[in-house]
């Protein structure tokens, strides 16, 4: 065991090439010098060495970098990127998106491993927010990146970084994280037309309050019933006939067949059944006429 | 290959509890947001609760204060603690992993309660 602890006369490793995958493990530590390792690591990945002997390059690199890689080094790690741990991950310094996208490129594909949640973590730290290059970044290789983060996770994103989200980003969201997106969206999509507008904010109304949907029935958005029955309960029923009647425009039929699901069903109970006579669509379950309509909301608010 | 398996649904009284698990395997569960969903006859889907990678929890309103999620990592499992059940939540109980890549159910798991 002692002697293979000395490098071979003349397998002193000159460059990093193809004649190394030819070298028994060993050989590899005795021959290849870290800090050439280090300087030519882009020529790794065109290598197709073992896992193996992929272990003895890392273990060459974490000796020469015990307090973790320098961004020079990790740009260029390649498929030596699925050899590192989480740990490894923590004492790196990430700071160039050319570097993350690199390294997510690597695991492309497949589910998030631990290894990339800690880089992407460590990444989106180092940024201080999740800022749009950055999100766009990370929806491209993980649609559903957005939906997997807690509202108060979201809570730390700007803005300005909506304009990187597209519909199909939002579909596994859950309310709570709608709540957060939707005021960051209205705040993002302001300056944009009322058409306009609407195609951008749709698909964040999930979260959107009663107001801002008695706004939107005055500007003829036609929403669909689709959108219609994601939005809030609570924000849907205090909407009168005649303002649902304007979000929807001709999607209003499509009430009839949603007349049992929530939110259609719990805004029917609330509407009277005269009003909702009006919309020609045999909606029954509405308020008869003649009873009185308490506000028990208001009556605990005075009370 | 990626499995969700629920399990723990029963038949309850009303104001009896259940406790309804959920067992993943094939992606990285600590990275995921976990979620219940349920489903009442002739209903549409609707969501109950979430656990997220990073510790918090959400509730819809009409279970909060009875229902309590929560996750464990080391097993990749997801729990709902239902107590003070009403008939009204009867329903199929779906458990959803929402990885960073794409969301994946389970096939369900019945809570019928009677009164």
């Known amino acids: 065991e002692v002697e293979k602890t000395a490098c071979p006369s003349g397998k002193k490793a000159r460059e990093i090439d193809e004649s190394l995958i030819f070298y028994k493990k060993w050989e590899l530590e005795a021959c290849v010098d870290a800090a050439l390792l280090a300087t030519q690591m882009d020529r790794v990945n065109a290598i197709p060495f073992t896992y193996e002997q992929l272990d003895v390059l890392k273990h060459k690199l974490d000796e020469l970098y015990p307090q973790g890689y320098p961004e020079s080094v990790i740009q260029h790690l390649g498929y030596l990127f699925l050899k590192m741990s989480p740990e490894d991950i923590r004492k790196w310094n990430v700071t160039s998106l050319e570097t993350l996208k690199a390294l997510l490129e690597v695991n492309k594909g497949h589910e998030m491993s631990p290894q990339v949640a800690t880089l992407i973590d460590r990444f989106v730290k180092g940024r201080g927010q999740l800022d749009k290059d950055t999100l766009d970044t990370l929806t491209a290789f993980y649609p559903g990146y957005l939906c997997s983060l807690s509202p108060e996770e979201l809570s730390s994103v700007p803005p300005s970084s909506i304009w990187a989200v597209r519909p199909q980003d939002l579909d596994t969201c859950d309310p709570r994280q709608l709540d957060v997106l939707y005021p960051k969206a209205r705040l993002a999509f302001q300056n944009m037309n009322g058409s306009e507008y609407f195609v951008k904010i749709q698909s964040f109304l999930g979260g959107a309050p009663t107001e801002d949907l008695k706004a939107l029935s005055q500007q003829n958005v036609s929403m669909d019933l689709a959108t219609f029955m994601k939005l809030r309960t609570d924000a849907v029923l205090p909407l009168t006939v005649a303002e649902v009647q304007k979000l929807l425009g001709p999607h209003v039929e499509g009430l009839k067949a949603e007349e049992r699901h929530r939110p259609v069903r719990d805004w029917i109970l609330r509407q009277r059944q005269d009003d909702l006579d009006t919309l020609g669509l045999g909606l029954q379950g509405g308020i008869p006429n003649g009873y009185l309509v308490l506000d028990l909301s208001m009556q605990e608010a005075l009370s | 290959e990626v499995q969700v398996v629920e399990s723990g649904g029963g038949l309850v009284q009303a104001g009896g509890s259940l406790r309804l698990s959920c067992v993943a395997s094939?992606?990285?569960?600590?990275?995921?947001?976990m979620r219940w969903y349920r489903q009442a006859p002739g209903k549409q889907r609707e969501w109950v609760a979430s656990?997220?990678?990073?510790?918090?929890?959400h509730y819809e309103d009409f279970v909060k204060g009875r229902f309590t999620i929560s996750r464990d990592d080391a097993k990749n499992t997801l729990y709902l603690q239902m107590d003070s059940l009403k008939p009204e939540d009867t329903a199929v109980y779906y458990c959803?992993?929402?990885?960073?890549?794409?969301?994946?159910w389970g096939q369900g798991t019945q809570v019928t309660v009677s009164s």
């Open positions: 094939g992606f990285t569960f600590s990275v995921a947001a």
């Open positions: 656990a997220f990678s990073d510790g918090n929890l």
């Open positions: 959803n992993a929402g990885t960073p890549s794409r969301a994946y």
